[in-house]
């Protein structure tokens, strides 16, 4: 291990700078110019520089699990853990599930309504007495309820024509009822009798576009438990359908902006707010279905069985089960997705800050091992066949006494972990003897807490009247600076600077602000090595033959001189021995600028005065053409042609010189004039 | 990155001619300028030629009118064609390459002696 510190002063900042951290409280453990930052080492640093074991302050993290009898079946435990955490430093506890036999069960049978469901509403019907008889199999306490939805109320989900709104249905003739989007029809119940009677009662309905509105249902059954009754035992939500469904976005389609809010908006059993608010996303039904420990089973027909599959990856603790097209075979598709969500165990844990990271590792009845994964994970659990969680919690700073929940999804137990910061460091109490100190102050982990008025790392330095402020002052380069730059002690207004166990490194300079190191670095060396240059307070001196700001260049141009041995052609600078060119120049040497615009237009008027001593710089032809020089022979590079002052064309050529705006001209000894109407 | 191979070099009376080659490999598209520097005993080097990937050249007063820069093979060989040889262009000669920068690339170098 490892034992990053920053300006380190007392031994609780230490033990926050890593797990690796150790501090040493032995007297006179720093020698003079010794920082206290050097008392926080790893143990085997401070051993090797004579701290003595029981000198070494190393608070660890431990777990402490406390088991509550109290109370009916508990499938989970211990029901509580009390950490104290290190930073940096994991606390790990064990958590044993042991899945019960018999546990009590609601299950909420939620239907699609539109009208491709109808033969399906003729079977469900007569589902109740089935239901309950298939739920009393698995648990001596199972109670039924029924709800249904088709979708919002508005275009494009339903056809609002007045005739279509009464009556949905393709089939007129059909009694049929107006579409909804949620209706909660029965309150979770024992009696199939009811369950037969209120489920009787119900007409198919009917939409207009293919997905329905199943999330929004979903999301009222689950954050309305009052409402639908669920009890604090397993739950599950059969949702069945032979569609597609809406989510969040799909609103805008109605001119429906308003994020779902995740709130229950049931009023006389029916989601009358639906047109008001969007479709929830994925992520927070699941969210609010894991918060609420209900697990979805989606009864969807065999064209849809992939699509809902998909969405059991996002929902934890679902599954998917093949309906048959009139929904006939409901009872046993429901036993067999029961069974495989009670044997597969999530072990979980409610959102905490950044400040604590959990991992669990798992290991399961049948050998399977998952280590380091972000929550538990368990399948082919049996009845009283014990699992166990190993969980793993880290504080990554100091953290304020809180507490948070774990719990398998779809249960009720939880496990309630409380966290406490292990940061205090334990000293032998020698406060009493303030000799140490020169009498003027106490000793608190080998280090001297002064009385006021005395300063010091023994408290040796009388303030004589000036504040510690006012010393510390002299102390520090300007008012923002900390004293001594954080690299020396403040003795008596003076920096006394840290000798650095980094060798070749010297703190130094009134205010300690200097060292012999931190200077930009090449070839992994403080400015380039001995041989290139020293550092000296923050900058590179470089010896003769090396410049750059870590002493990284040689001090030559030859990369930088073209075939006249022009510096960058007179249009750049060089630095380092490579050209920085000005804009719009190319390296290596600033020769092309194939950006720049064509320099014709610009010389028409110095090639009409330098060959024919005419045009608007006729007069002073030199001082206004300054970059030109007229060649009596044919010049190699731009050919122009332009017309004058006189509107006759003019053919010439320019040749770049070096520098900027220098150019060889070459202009044809024939115009072309035009001659204009008579 | 780029490897570039010189040959053609070798011993030629005053007043002969040599033709040296530059083959480059590797990442070679993105080269818009290639250079023929030369070394003599004792002295600098010197750049002499110049040729851009727009195709225009530079040369150093010396051996202007003697020498001539080109490049072949889509810009992958450039030759430096010397005539008219002199004893003062007794040196090595290195062909150097730059990639949309500064010169980065150097070929190992090619003997040219111009005996008296």
């Known amino acids: 291990q490892e034992c990053t510190k920053f300006k380190v002063s007392s031994c609780r900042e230490c033990i926050e700078s890593g797990p690796g951290c150790t501090w040493c409280q032995k007297l006179n453990f720093t020698g003079p110019g010794d920082p206290d930052s050097i008392r926080c080492d790893t143990r085997p640093q401070l051993l090797m520089r004579g701290c003595a074991a029981d000198d070494i302050m190393d608070p660890t993290s431990l777990a402490e699990t406390q088991e509550d009898h109290n109370g009916g079946q508990k499938q989970l435990s211990p029901q509580k853990v009390t950490l104290y955490l290190r930073p940096g430093q994991a606390a790990a506890f064990n958590v044993t599930f042991r899945r019960a036999k018999g546990y009590p069960i609601d299950l909420y049978y939620l239907m699609d309504l539109s009208y491709s469901m109808l033969d399906d509403l003729r079977n469900v019907k007569k589902l109740g007495g089935d239901l309950l008889r298939a739920l009393n199999e698995i648990t001596e306490s199972g109670r039924i309820g029924f709800g249904s939805f088709v979708d919002k109320t508005v275009l494009p989900f339903v056809n609002t024509h007045p005739d279509k709104l009464r009556n949905p249905c393709p089939n007129k003739e059909k009694e049929c009822q107006p579409p909804f989007a949620f209706r909660h029809v029965l309150k979770l119940t024992n009696n199939s009798n009811q369950f037969q009677t209120e489920v009787g009662k119900q007409l198919i309905s009917g939409n207009l576009d293919a997905p329905e509105g199943g999330l929004d249902a979903m999301m009222q059954v689950a954050a309305c438990p009052e409402e639908i009754g669920w009890r604090n035992v397993t739950r599950l939500l059969v949702f069945a359908t032979d569609d597609g469904f809406h989510f969040a976005g799909d609103g805008k389609l109605g001119a429906i902006l308003t994020p779902n809010d995740g709130r229950c908006h049931l009023e006389d059993n029916l989601y009358k707010r639906s047109n008001e608010f969007d479709y929830p996303s994925v992520g927070q039904l699941a969210h609010k279905l894991a918060e609420n420990n209900i697990q979805p089973i989606f009864a969807v027909t065999s064209r849809m069985v992939k699509t809902y599959e998909k969405l059991t990856e996002i929902i934890p603790k679902s599954a998917v089960g093949e309906l048959s097209e009139d929904s006939s075979n409901v009872v046993h598709l429901i036993k067999n997705a029961y069974n495989k969500l009670s044997s597969r165990v999530f072990l979980d844990h409610n959102a905490l800050p950044d400040t604590l990271k959990v991992t669990y590792d798992s290991f399961c009845s049948n050998g399977v091992t998952h280590r380091n994964q972000p929550r538990g994970d368990c399948d082919g659990v049996q009845i009283n066949v014990p699992i166990t969680f190993q969980v793993k919690v880290t504080a990554t700073e100091c953290i304020q006494e809180q507490s948070f929940v774990i719990r398998a999804l779809g249960f009720t137990d939880i496990v309630t972990v409380q966290v406490l910061p292990q940061c205090e460091c334990r000293c032998r109490d020698q406060s009493r003897d303030r000799s140490l100190c020169h009498g003027k102050g106490f000793l608190e982990c080998g280090i001297c807490r002064c009385d006021t008025g005395y300063i010091g790392k023994n408290c040796e330095c009388q303030t004589q009247g000036r504040s510690s402020q006012e010393l510390e002052g002299s102390c520090r380069k300007d008012n923002n600076s900390i004293i001594c730059s954080g690299l020396g002690d403040c003795v008596c207004g003076q920096c006394l600077c840290h000798t650095s166990d980094v060798p070749g490194k010297l703190i130094y300079g009134q205010y300690c602000e200097c060292d012999t190191i931190n200077c930009e670095r090449y070839n992994g060396q403080v400015c380039g090595g001995p041989g290139r240059g020293l550092c000296f307070c923050g900058k590179c001196r470089c010896h003769p033959g090396f410049e750059g700001s870590a002493c990284q260049c040689e001090r030559t141009t030859e990369g930088c001189l073209n075939p006249r041995r022009v510096e960058c052609s007179g249009r750049g600078r060089c630095r380092c021995n490579v050209c920085e060119c000005h804009s719009g120049y190319q390296l290596p040497l600033c020769q092309e600028c194939p950006g720049c615009p064509s320099p014709c237009g610009k010389y028409i008027s110095c090639a009409e005065c330098l060959k024919f001593e005419k045009g608007p710089f006729g007069k002073n032809c030199s001082a206004a053409c300054p970059g030109l020089q007229l060649s009596n022979n044919p010049v190699k590079g731009r050919t122009c042609k332009e017309r004058d002052s006189e509107g006759c064309w003019v053919a010439y050529t320019l040749e770049q010189q070096d520098g900027m705006d220098r150019y060889l001209i070459y202009v044809d000894e024939s115009r072309e004039c035009v001659a204009g109407p008579n | 990155e780029v490897q570039l191979v010189e040959s053609g070099g070798g011993l030629v009376q005053t007043g002969g001619s040599l033709r040296l080659s530059c083959a480059a490999s590797g990442s070679t598209f993105n080269i818009n300028a290639w250079g023929w520097y030369r070394q003599a005993p004792g002295k600098q080097r010197e750049l002499v030629a110049v040729i851009s990937s727009s195709g225009s050249t530079d040369y150093s007063d010396a051996v202007k009118g003697r020498f001539t820069i080109s490049t072949v093979n889509a810009g992958n060989t450039v030759y430096l064609e010397m005539n008219s040889l002199k004893p003062e262009d007794t040196a090595v000669y290195y062909c150097?390459?730059?990639?949309?920068?500064?010169?980065?690339?150097w070929g190992q170098g090619s003997q040219v002696t111009v005996s008296s």
């Open positions: 150097r390459a730059a990639d949309s920068g500064p010169w980065r690339y």
